[in-house]
């Protein structure tokens, strides 16, 4: 029983840095608990952008430093990552897991692009 | 550089209890399962156990459930095997390994260490 | 439990011959890892997400498959190359890996 995972192909930031995706599984088994991570892909180096375990029907909880936030709705995950420039545009990839009760599933998205282009600085005004 | 380092396996005999103890460096330990992987003389590779990242979600093959209990404890860097009523079958090299970032497959390993369970 | 056959048991080969080894589920696999084993030491992984090399591997080493079919290829075998290669699934527990093959020096 594979566990497929749904993503956007591309999504572009908002002019304050914000971009907001879905992250959706098919969940082969009934799990309770299940960890959700973003991680980013971008010349061939693989980093760990946060990650939050959650109850089924609780709300995500990622550490109070993560530039993540999220909301759990039944097999379906919307993440809002905040803060990006435009050095942070590259793959970003929600890997599922289902933690609990055993067996344990994993499934990887392909990827969403996030794009990221950074406000030109407001000109000098005489006002 | 990532590091794992195993001990605590020796002779024992059978019904009787040891703990393994593997000690890891070099990587953020709390962001990664650890697994026990075992080899008996021989023959091929068994997942045993892991622990999940924060310590509280743990899975066990089935052959050891019940008698084998894995623990972690994250300010230490440590993982640990709690084996009880030890059996022949359970002879073999353990391994500490590290889950990988794309899932719980293992990309860095302990040297192993040699339970040998005899009368 | 998923079962993962291995074969051939063993291959006999020569330094600069191409080895092709098969690994086999018996149920659909969502992500496969291959890993080379030489005696007295631990695994060190190859291949995950059955064609990804992982840090540090030569790229006479590949792998390609899917479904319930994989491969882990060297293409020209060098003299280190001669060791026992595992395939494990890691897609849901619990984890199993192939019985191995053996490339041993013709």
């Known amino acids: 029983k594979a566990m497929h995972v749904a993503q956007p192909a591309v999504v572009l930031a908002s002019s304050r840095g914000i971009a907001s995706f879905v992250c959706e599984y098919a969940s082969p088994g009934k799990a309770t608990e299940v960890r959700v991570t973003v991680l980013r892909q971008a010349d061939s180096q693989v980093t760990e952008v946060c990650a939050a375990t959650y109850m089924m029907g609780n709300e995500l909880t990622f550490l109070d430093d993560s530039i993540c936030t999220g909301t759990s709705s039944g097999n379906q995950v919307n993440l809002t990552i905040q803060g990006l420039r435009a050095m942070d545009t590259g793959l970003y990839i929600c890997k599922v897991e289902l933690m609990y009760p055993p067996p344990y599933y994993l499934g990887i998205g392909n990827g969403t692009q996030i794009y990221v282009i950074d406000p030109e600085p407001c000109p000098d005004s005489d006002f | 550089q990532v590091q794992l380092v195993e001990s605590g396996g020796g002779v024992v005999q059978p019904g009787r209890s040891l703990r393994l103890s593997c000690i890891a460096s070099?990587?953020?330990?709390?962001?990664?399962?650890m697994h026990w992987v075992r080899q008996a003389p021989g023959k091929g590779l068994e997942w045993v156990a892991v622990?999940?990242?924060?310590?509280?979600?743990?899975h066990y093959a089935d052959s050891v459930k019940g008698r084998f209990t894995i623990s972690r404890d994250n300010s230490k860097n440590t993982l640990y095997l709690q084996m009880n009523s030890l059996r022949a079958e359970d002879t073999a090299v353990y391994y500490c390994?590290?889950?990988?970032?794309?899932?719980?497959?293992?990309?860095?390993w302990g040297q192993g260490t040699l339970v040998t369970v005899s009368s | 439990e998923i079962v993962l056959t291995q074969s051939p048991g063993t291959l006999s080969l020569s330094p600069g011959e191409r080895a092709t080894l098969s690994c086999r589920a018996s149920q659909s696999v969502s992500y496969l890892a291959w890993y080379q084993q030489k005696p007295g030491q631990a695994p060190r992984l190859l291949i995950y997400g059955a064609s990804s090399r992982a840090t540090g591997i030569p790229d006479r080493f590949s792998g390609s498959g899917s479904g319930t079919d994989f491969t882990l290829t060297i293409s020209r075998l060098e003299p280190e190359d001669f060791a026992v290669y595992y395939c494990?699934?890691?897609?849901?527990?619990?984890?199993?890996f192939g019985q191995g093959t053996k490339v041993e020096i013709k």
């Open positions: 070099g990587f953020t330990f709390s962001s990664y399962g």
């Open positions: 390994a590290r889950g990988g970032v794309w899932g719980p497959y293992f990309d860095y």
């Open positions: 622990n999940w990242y924060d310590g509280s979600n743990k």
């Open positions: 494990q699934q890691y897609g849901s527990s619990p984890w199993t």
